[in-house]
């Protein structure tokens, strides 16, 4: 099976690596920019130079490349609670992150905001906080968890998955709640 | 085919609450988090909340904290926002919105039809 290339790619992949084809004149491959700068004007013939500039501020391109303009610098979120761990730079974009125990949630695959790791109060810890995961924990007897948080089985209701974990409890309370009965 | 209706919208005085509703169908609803959009007249589309699947993880607009309230039924495949407090800036069309799952440059994949919120005296 041949897969299936965009135009770009069929284009470029007439020249050897490294270079692009013209796109005014297709005998001529001209050589790709290098990470950090962006093409100004293609090589004006075979075996000349390609007019590559620099990134100016706020933009970069962090590959070999033949576009026309820089990319954007990203910008980390702050009301997403992101910190930037690295600053944009002409070949390298913006590295954003979270503090010290925390945590990245992904809303989507480029999209993710930060929480604070569970401290398993009333528990042990199972699993360490990752940089893409929570704590686990581990609920000491008489708690149970709760969005990674171990609660006490006085707050399980009946009708909640913590019954099979608390049952000892809710069977007391119902025993005190019976024999109180008259 | 995948369906995201909301209901729950209307004209209500300052101070007042809402809770909006979005009945979710044609795809697992489990397997998603999922937004409230909302666009105020004139006004570009700004990011309400998000929930997580499992509903776990939420995130509110500056905006909204303390007031609105995301939430789930898994169970019913429903979303839901509880409005409190509104403020006139609350008057928008609220759209309820499923996250893609896939680098692509929007960030929701799918959008019910919206619901008009009017907060007016």
């Known amino acids: 099976l041949v897969p299936h290339l965009g135009d770009r790619e069929k284009r470029d992949s007439v020249c050897p690596q490294g270079k692009y084809i013209h796109p005014q004149n297709n005998s001529i491959c001209c050589t790709k920019c290098h990470k950090g700068t962006y093409l100004y004007n293609d090589c004006p013939g075979p075996g000349q130079d390609t007019d590559c500039r620099e990134c100016e501020s706020g933009s970069f391109t962090a590959s070999e490349n033949h576009l026309r303009h820089c990319l954007s610098c990203s910008k980390c979120r702050k009301e997403m609670g992101q910190v930037e761990i690295s600053s944009c730079t002409v070949d390298r974009d913006t590295v954003c992150g979270c503090r010290k125990n925390q945590y990245r949630h992904y809303w989507s695959e480029n999209l993710f905001q930060c929480f604070n790791c569970s401290l398993c109060l009333n528990g042990t810890v199972h699993l360490s906080c990752q940089e893409k995961q929570n704590t686990v924990c581990t609920c000491h007897a008489g708690f149970f968890l709760r969005e990674n948080e171990c609660v006490s089985c006085s707050n399980c209701k009946k009708s909640l998955e913590c019954t099979k974990l608390c049952l000892p409890q809710i069977e007391n309370v119902k025993g005190t709640e019976d024999s109180g009965t008259t | 085919e995948v369906q995201l209706l909301e209901s729950g919208g209307g004209l209500v005085q300052p101070g007042g609450s809402l809770r909006l509703s979005c009945a979710a169908s044609?795809?697992?609803?489990?397997?998603?988090?999922m937004a409230w959009v909302r666009q105020a007249p004139g006004k570009g589309l700004e990011w309400v909340s998000f929930?997580?699947?499992?509903?776990?993880?939420?995130y509110y607009a500056d905006s909204v904290k303390g007031r609105f309230t995301i939430s789930r039924d898994n169970s019913k495949n429903t979303l839901y926002l509880q409005m409190n407090s509104l403020r006139a800036e609350d008057t928008a069309v609220y759209y309820c919105?499923?996250?893609?799952?896939?680098?692509?440059?929007?960030?929701?994949?799918?959008w019910g039809q919206g619901t008009l919120v009017t907060v007016s005296s």
């Open positions: 929930i997580s699947q499992e509903g776990h993880h939420t």
């Open positions: 044609g795809f697992t609803f489990t397997d998603y988090n």
């Open positions: 919105a499923k996250f893609s799952t896939i680098a692509t440059l929007s960030l929701f994949d799918y």
